[in-house]
């Protein structure tokens, strides 16, 4: 569900939302760490309806959700929660 990308692109998010998105509507979450042309961390939610939402990294719901997913990934065997793609 969570993906961390390191890119050399500028910031991708123009507008950010803090509104809670239920997990059943989410396809995947892409995390873009700050640096490489963008001064801030960006979180992009790809939804099952094919739309894309930039989420404010400070939004309480996304922080809580990522914490849950991190805990789950460290305590279960299947696929890791973070998939790192390094160019």
């Amino acid at each position: 569900v969570l993906e961390v990308y390191y890119t050399s692109l500028r910031c991708r998010c123009v507008q950010e939302s803090s509104v809670f998105i239920p997990r059943r509507f989410i396809d995947r979450i892409q995390i873009l760490p700050r640096g490489n042309g963008c001064p801030r961390k960006e979180i992009i939610v790809w939804k099952k309806n094919k739309s894309i939402v930039c989420v404010d990294p400070q939004a309480e719901w996304i922080q809580r959700m990522m914490e849950v997913l991190r805990k789950r990934s460290s305590s279960t065997l299947p696929v890791p929660v973070f998939k790192r793609k390094i160019p």
Partner: antibody, heavy 120, light 107 residues
């Protein structure tokens, strides 16, 4: 203007069947999840179930999934609730609602409700 | 299933009063909570989503707060047209569940 117009309610005998309809206008119906919610006389709201835009995911309240079937026809902008083997406790006002998955993620538009009475 | 325990079940208040309703989830629902207003014989109306966001056109006297398991709905200054039953709902996960409702009356 968004409108959800419901029909199909009425009196049905215990053990019988009924199909409720919800016709949508003013929205791109085929893009949205839709839900059914019911309310027994003098009681609170109870979620019945929901269906995603292409009908590939349908979630039900566990106590109802064996008797109730939710479906939709995007070509007709319509949502349906097929009720089988009805019981007295299914007597309620049934509402259809849009389950928004673009901006609010809650039920932002509701039908006017249709009354189902189960009695012999 | 996630239970939503709403209190009080009924409430009598005067015009201009501050009214508070609480909702407690049986497990963590993040901020996946909505609040609805229902008047007799009418369909519910969405007031608050994502625990604290006012829906389009909803007056500023209505507000919500909370996360995790504890949520609060507030009417800062009760108006005669606010007489209704109010419901919390969790939409964090299915089956979606509602609180039992709070019937608000004018003193």
């Amino acid at each position: 203007e968004v409108q959800l117009v419901q029909s199909g309610g009425g009196l049905v005998q215990p053990g019988g069947s009924l199909r409720l309809s919800c016709a949508a206008s003013g929205i791109d119906f085929s893009r949205y999840w839709m839900s059914w919610v019911r309310q027994a006389p003098g009681k609170g709201l109870e979620w019945v179930g929901e269906i995603n835009p292409d009908s590939s995911t349908i979630n039900y309240a566990p106590s109802l999934k064996d008797r109730f079937t939710i479906s939709r026809d995007n070509a007709k902008n319509s949502l349906y609730l097929q009720m089988n083997s009805v019981r007295a406790e299914d007597t309620a006002v049934y509402y259809c609602a849009r389950q928004d998955d673009y901006e609010y993620y809650a039920m932002d538009y509701w039908g006017q409700g249709t009354t189902v009475t189960v009695s012999s | 299933d996630i239970q939503m325990t709403q209190s009080p079940s009924s409430l009598s208040a005067s015009v201009g009063d501050r009214v508070t309703i609480t909702c407690k989830a049986s497990q963590d629902v993040n901020t996946g909570v909505a609040w609805y207003q229902q008047k007799p014989g009418k369909a519910p109306k969405l007031l608050i989503y994502s625990a604290s966001y006012r829906y389009t056109g909803v007056p500023s006297r209505f507000s919500g707060s909370g996360s995790g398991t504890d949520f609060t709905f507030t009417i800062s200054s009760l108006q005669p047209e606010d007489i209704a039953t109010y419901y919390c709902q969790q939409y964090y996960s299915t089956p979606l569940t509602f609180g039992g409702g709070t019937k608000l009356e004018i003193k």
